[in-house]
């Protein structure tokens, strides 16, 4: 049977969730007045770029929208973007779509997402509310790169 993406709400240790603002993803406090995105996650079938030490290769999309997370270089810096793309279109491609790929690694009960196109660059939220989700190579105090994937019905 055809594979289906897994659905999660995504949250960090400061109880910030991911929210769609226009065509951007921002971090906002978990709140009744804010509708967090449901993240779609599906494994890549092609093993060309696989590296088990870094985690499983996955595509990340926004449920209910034809939007997927995508890494591209802007002014020489790896940048996280949303691109109009159906996650299942990426999945059915025989060849791995590298800019859309992330290494999904588990660290304790949290998940970490590293760009396949830009090794050492991780999906992150800043400590300030309302800021875009971004890529960073600085893991630590000022950036949060560990996320909780909460099951949603």
């Amino acid at each position: 049977r055809e594979a289906a993406p897994k659905s999660y709400a995504i949250r960090d240790s400061r109880q910030m969730v991911w929210v769609l603002s226009g065509n951007s993803l921002i971090a906002a406090p978990l709140s009744r007045s804010i509708k967090p995105v449901t993240l779609h996650l599906i494994a890549c079938r092609d093993t060309e770029f696989s590296d088990k030490e870094k985690g499983n290769m996955v595509y990340l999309g926004i449920k209910g929208k034809d939007l997927c997370l995508f890494c591209a270089e802007i002014q020489g810096k790896p940048t996280l973007q949303l691109k109009e793309k159906n996650i299942m279109d990426l999945y059915v491609e025989k060849k791995a779509q590298k800019p859309f790929l992330f290494f999904h690694n588990k660290e304790g009960s949290t998940s970490v997402f590293q760009s396949v196109s830009y090794p050492g660059w991780f999906i992150a939220t800043s400590t300030t509310s309302g800021q875009p989700i971004f890529l960073t190579k600085e893991r630590g105090i000022t950036n949060n790169t560990n996320f909780y994937l909460d099951s949603v019905e």
């Epitope: 910030m16 406090p29 009744r32 509310s129």
Partner: antibody, heavy 122, light 111 residues
Amino acid sequence: ELQLQESGPGLVKPSETLSLTCTVSGGSITSSNYYWGWIRQPPGKGLEWIGSIDYTGSTYYNPSLKSRVTISVDTSKNQFSLKLSSVTAADTAVYYCATGKYYETYLGFDVWGQGTLVTVSS
Amino acid sequence: ESVLTQPPSVSGAPGQRVTISCTGSSSNIGAHYDVHWYQQLPGTAPKLLIYGNDNRPSGVPDRFSGSKSGTSASLAITGLQAEDEADYYCQSYDYSLSGYVFGGGTKLTVL
């Protein structure tokens, strides 16, 4: 319906460790998106959050108590517990366990135990 | 000293309207975390009265309402009744502490 019940000694000696357990009934402690907390209330005073543990096993502690607090879960008994070390008379309080659900109560606590009074005295 | 500030006491006659304020900062209420209100009747455990700033759990009378603006929140009680005499606490989340915070509590006296 989810219910919580605190248990543990009502009297603890100074410098010893206070140990309390909260038994969860009417639901599983491992159910997705739940968080479980300990809150205390010294006699005649207000509520103070001690710490929490959630369904992932992640713990969060009040910075003012962090060095003395441990919260853990026993999934086989459907319980979570509090340990507070090196207690003094200032730790005398009614201790409550409480729970909420991330995407339903939004970091509030909608179910509480009835509370248990712990006195620190020699 | 509590992270969230409430008046120690308020009072009102039966049938009147009273409000209880809760003032936080840019790392809790002002950061858009929700405010929750609890009622604690004498000798009992706190009970959730308002969650998510302005929502009543089932069974809570519509005489109780909550609101939030900026770094502050308020609980309003209309048509005050003798059984409303209790302590009221506000609560939120503070990202700088990575934890839950309470107000110091407000004692409501029905005259």
